[in-house]
Interface confidence: low
């Protein structure tokens, strides 16, 4: 289970049509589920119901984003429609570059996604927990345009880091 | 801040056409399904139509198939309800929907003011 | 298609515990999603995947159930929460909607 460094990018825009950008970095940890590669796209935040879908079809939508996912208390979802790997694989299918969970509140989940499976997922699938998961969800939540770099080895630079 | 505003509803004979017309502005348009949903007194809330972010899917219900085409315009943020050989039971407050969450359409997030459509002749 | 049942009407006293029952005709997993709608206006969503508060929403409100019986509770009712309440299902397709059910204040 190789670390994932994580730049979060924030884009802020000021009256003047201006944008100002903060950069946050945050670790987590590749899982088993998903290949250890680079990855980088604008933020969609997924909640983990909208990864139903009783359609057999599958919806490609444009290539190139980074699903995160907050995972719930599992007592808020007794049944849930998909396993947490099978909701990595429906993002992916839905043309995420990578997703990235959010196992604070479901941290069993951590062993679902490292179990490996005979056939992984081509891109990554990364959980984050504590205070990396509290930075990441407090960008996520602003409802901005952010973008994430995930990369398995730090960053070459060092990175300016502003506590979101 | 999310803002959907509707346009092009009226007063329209029986067999006649209309197009609705939605304005989105406040949020990535190209990440979301959208959906019309209507309201008539004497039937409620009902769903009539969705659509996928990149606009590859539609959906609708039964009753309105053939009849109705939902599109919408990415580029423009606009999306769109044709209704043709409008009928009796068309007459409704039509509204433009923002599913949620991302990439997954599963309740109706935002709504639009409305717009009404009266087929009478 | 799946069929909602709600309670047509409800007359309460301001500061009362109130809870509006939804029905659906099979299970439709936590997949009930919560709308109120003011005289004049459009609909607001409350509550989706039956309990989760959307954002906004005060926590006079909140949400349960799971397979075909669910549950609005508003406590404790204030007199801006006249409105009808309107609950829709996502599991099942076409996603349907309640019938509503109007909350009055004495």
């Known amino acids: 289970k190789e670390t994932a460094f994580v730049e979060v990018v924030l884009f802020e825009s000021s009256p003047s049509g201006d944008y100002t950008t903060y950069t946050t970095g945050l670790t987590g940890r590749f899982s088993r589920a998903g290949a250890t590669l680079s990855a980088e796209g604008e933020i969609v935040q997924m909640h983990p119901l909208g990864l139903c879908n009783n359609n057999d079809e599958e919806d490609l939508y444009e290539y190139g984003w980074v699903g995160v996912v907050k995972l719930e208390q599992p007592e808020l979802d007794p049944k849930p429609c998909l396993t947490v790997l099978g909701k990595a694989k429906r993002a992916v299918q839905r043309g995420a570059t990578a997703v990235i969970f959010d196992v604070s509140e479901n941290p069993e989940a951590i062993d679902q996604l490292n179990q490996g499976s005979e056939d992984p997922l081509k891109r990554p699938v990364v959980y984050v927990k504590g205070a990396d998961a509290i930075k990441l969800m407090n960008i996520v939540n602003k409802q901005k345009v952010a973008r994430a770099r995930i990369q398995h080895r730090p960053p070459r630079q060092p990175t300016e880091y502003f506590d979101m | 801040e999310v803002h959907l505003v509707e346009s092009g509803g009226g007063l329209v004979q029986p067999g006649g056409s209309l197009k609705l017309s939605c304005a989105a502005s406040g949020f990535t348009f190209s990440n979301y399904d959208m959906a019309w949903v209507r309201q008539a007194p004497t039937r409620g809330l009902e769903w009539v139509a969705s659509?996928?972010?990149?606009?590859?899917?539609?959906y609708y219900r039964d009753s309105v198939k053939g009849r109705l085409t939902i599109s919408r315009n990415n580029a423009e943020n606009t999306q769109y309800l044709q209704i043709d050989s409008l009928r009796s039971e068309d007459t409704a407050t039509y509204y433009c929907?923002?599913?949620?969450?991302?990439?997954?359409?599963?309740?109706?997030?935002?709504w639009g003011q409305g717009t009404l459509v009266t087929v009478s002749s | 298609d799946t069929v909602l049942t709600q309670s047509p009407a409800l007359t309460v006293s301001p500061g009362d515990k109130i809870t509006i029952s939804c029905r659906a005709s099979?299970?439709?997993?936590?997949?009930i999603h919560w709308y109120q709608q003011k005289s004049g206006q459009q609909p607001k969503l409350l509550i989706y995947g039956a309990s989760n508060l959307d954002s906004g929403v005060p926590d006079r409100f909140s949400g349960s159930g799971f397979g075909t019986d669910f549950t609005l509770t508003i406590d404790p009712v204030e007199a801006s929460d006249t409105a009808t309440y309107f609950c829709q299902q996502s599991w099942n397709v076409p996603h349907t909607f309640g019938g509503g059910t109007k909350l009055e204040l004495k």
């Open positions: 099979e299970g439709v997993n936590t997949r």
């Open positions: 659509i996928s972010p990149g606009g590859g899917k539609t």
């Open positions: 929907s923002r599913l949620g969450p991302a990439y997954s359409g599963e309740w109706f997030a935002y």
